[in-house]
Amino acid sequence: AVDLTLLANLRLTDPQRFFLTCVSGEAGAGRGSDAWGPPLLLEKDDRIVRTPPGPPLRLARNGSHQVTLRGFSKPSDLVGVFSCVGGAGARRTRVIYVHNSPGAHLLPDKVTHTVNKGDTAVLSARVHKEKQTDVIWKSNGSYFYTLDWHEAQDGRFLLQLPNVQPPSSGIYSATYLEASPLGSAFFRLIVRGCGAGRWGPGCTKECPGCLHGGVCHDHDGECVCPPGFTGTRCEQACREGRFGQSCQEQCPGISGCRGLTFCLPDPYGCSCGSGWRGSQCQEACAPGHFGADCRLQCQCQNGGTCDRFSGCVCPSGWHGVHCEKSDRIPQILNMASELEFNLETMPRINCAAAGNPFPVRGSIELRKPDGTVLLSTKAIVEPEKTTAEFEVPRLVLADSGFWECRVSTSGGQDSRRFKVNVKVPPVPLAAPRLLTKQSRQLVVSPLVSFSGDGPISTVRLHYRPQDSTMDWSTIVVDPSENVTLMNLRPKTGYSVRVQLSRPGEGGEGAWGPPTLMTTDCPEPLLQPWLEGWHVEGTDRLRVSWSLPLVPGPLVGDGFLLRLWDGTRGQERRENVSSPQARTALLTGLTPGTHYQLDVQLYHCTLLGPASPPAHVLLPPSGPPAPRHLHAQALSDSEIQLTWKHPEALPGPISKYVVEVQVAGGAGDPLWIDVDRPEETSTIIRGLNASTRYLFRMRASIQGLGDWSNTVEESTLGNGLQAEGPVQESRAAEEGLDQ
């Protein structure tokens, strides 16, 4: 199980002194700087128990493996569910603490209930402040059951849950119907995935027999030991005031673990520290009791005395949980409670024993989980002990589990179980990811998902040109860093593979799948320059450029023109996909805009140096169209046009332009300027008789505006052929602008 403890300080006289601390004993826990070590998270979980919003809680990190939550301002801030998450990958674990208000109407007799699959769980809510109304039980925030207030038994409301299954796990609450939810009794029910004493898929494996109140984990068969105990079977007591899987942590403050609730990974739940009991963990154990919540009884024999933290303290000549074993009986010494090896390795395991008579090589044996017995290949005999060495055959996954070292002499026998974890070297499930590429280097992210077991100690990146038979180049990198492959050939495909390793002999995994990464083209080096440009309309610009002459083929696929509109903060990019092109027409520009213009050569995805920029001002767009244009024939050669000025003018009109065209004619139209912008009529002269004409107009301010509607009119008959139309405005002759 993950070495993760959530501590709640229950000295509740002042909520501002209340704190929660999450402590991880995992290697590298809480670093959070890379994908291999996510941070410890400690938070209030408001999904089930919602409390009124208050000021945000303060989270303080103390080193890499501890995080503390403070800033509780009122007692209601404390009520509810808190969780700490730690461990990496598949070992990521959530530890949960449920806090009850000491002033609630209903109080739990016991907050955490850990039961086996198929058991009957009984949750008991003690009446603290009576109300004569229904009691509603909820499970994970949803309605579960109702009890009449008359149904209390000895001042307690009981919820019986027969034949519980793992989905029944969760937060239960008992609340008087018309009371505040904060006055509820909150419980945590943990249902192991197996029946008593069993673990594993199908619950076929036997638990190691956890001591001192340890709980067998239904997934891995490990004992989750109560705070203050350690060892594969929780057989060893820590020194007073210490906790953690290796007793490595110390309770804060001068009164040791008094007033602290300890929450551990499921299926353990929460309890007081060793030697303490009571709803606030402030009461010392009664004589003859010891351990977490004082749940254990000493029953010491042969003159042993009961210590409330560790149990029986035996006089010399005796050992065992109850001082029931004589020291003449052989004893396994200093056996590690857990060993880790990599798959398919052939490790050596040592087992030391002492006793009277003295154990010899043949009296010590090693038993594997499948019952196979290994005999030692050699033994080292010292004055105080014999150490037997066992050569283990090539390990397979089925060797994971509890091994046993057993010593037998005429004085008796002793055995010690220890956990062997056979770890699978990591194998990448995916190819490495290309982050960026240049012509001579590739930047690669080697962090990929993997099968097998972590932690990852090293990452090797193997690479060589595609279709090459040359040796692979290898680079060893830190797991958390991106890798730059240097000195590569441009425009070349490289096959790249990742190999991961975990600690220990034989920890190198197989190579991951290959991926093809291609270096970029050579960068284009030529810098174009802008030859010129001219405006072809209020929104059109023709640009031309040149390139320096250099020997050899041109390295480039085309040109990129960039127009920067500084006023609006917008960039327009125009791709010219021929490297031979030296001119381009840019359309759809914004009239009246000041643009900065440059051009650069591109090759593949790489851009060459930009030309020196040019600054171009497009003329503004013209005014709206004149309104209500009307044509009226005056004679066989004259037509009068009348109109109304455009609306919403952006400035004074400088002139009008009339377009004249013979209806159905194929020739170009004629443009005639009306240079008196105040006028609203004009006469077009010199037209042909009996001819149908089309007219339209537009105004000009700084640029020409929109055309008006087109009107048709025919000249009167019997006239002579005219030289061409001219215009008169209020009897003033004007020139022709074609």
Epitope: D134, I136, Y143, F144, Y145, T146, L147, D148, H150, E151, L177, E178
Partner: antibody, heavy 117, light 105 residues
Framework: EVQLLESGGGLVQPGGSLRLSCAAS????????MNWVRQAPGKGLEWVSR????????VYADSVKGRFTISRDNSKNTLYLQMNSLRAEDTAVYYC??????????WGRGTLVTVSS | DIQMTQSPATLSLSPGDRAILSCRAS??????LAWYQQKPGQAPRLLIY???HRATGIPPRFSGSGSGTDFTLTISSLEPEDFAVYFC???????FGGGTKVEIK
């Protein structure tokens, strides 16, 4: 689908008896309090009786106290109302209703009881 | 006993109108009040509980407010299917109000 289905209604003479049943499905019947609510023709709703999930506690409206008995069989997911000494004013559609916090969140379609000579 | 009084007895409105229904308790009932809708020939349906919480599946045009003795059910914009009888109920002794009929004008 959560469902309640009443049965057992009919025509009965004053002073007679009738037993209504309500079959529950689609939820864990044994965990919920159950109620009978009635509605006289063209009138409003009147709560009649409630039974707690265990069956150990019951409560009645004053108008039916001593004449009606509510019961349940959790193994059969069924609620009952035994009605004795029936009166003309007991004529109504009788609904069975589930409650979780003394509000009726699931109702049956009702069964008509007519008390007439 | 706490008595529940609903007003008006009948409310004549058109689709799209806003409907405001009132329920008064004879004593303080905090927010322990529910509203139900009943259409002809059908069982009642829970709309609002604890004075202001919409029951599952109830559209947002239905809203409840009030606390103590005065409570209101508001239908923001009447749909054709909303024309029905509405009852309030206090949960202490399961007493219902006399009902308000919302009919088409």
């Amino acid at each position: 689908e959560v469902q309640l289905l009443e049965s057992g209604g009919g025509l009965v003479q004053p002073g007679g008896s009738l037993r209504l049943s309500c079959a529950a499905s689609g939820f864990t019947f044994s965990r919920y309090p159950m109620n009978w609510v009635r509605q006289a023709p063209g009138k409003g709703l009147e709560w009649v009786s409630r039974i707690w999930p265990s069956g150990g506690s019951t409560v009645y409206a004053d108008s039916v106290k001593g004449r009606f008995t509510i019961s349940r069989d959790n193994s059969k997911n069924t609620l009952y109302l035994q009605m004795n000494s029936l009166r003309a004013e007991d004529t109504a559609v009788y609904y069975c209703a589930r409650d979780s916090s003394r509000y009726f969140d699931v109702w049956g379609r009702g069964t008509l009881v007519t008390v007439s000579s | 006993d706490i008595q529940m009084t609903q007003s008006p007895a009948t409310l004549s409105l058109s689709p799209g109108d806003r409907a405001i229904l009132s329920c008064r308790a004879s004593h303080n009932i905090d927010n322990f009040l529910a509203w139900y809708q009943q259409k002809p020939g059908q069982a009642p349906r829970l709309l609002i509980y604890d004075a202001s919480h919409r029951a599952t599946g109830i559209p947002p045009r239905f809203s409840g407010s009030g606390s103590g003795t005065d409570f209101t059910l508001t239908i923001s914009s009447l749909e054709p299917e909303d024309f029905a009888v509405y009852f309030c109920q206090q949960r202490t002794n399961w007493l219902f109000g006399g009902g308000t009929k919302v009919e088409i004008k």
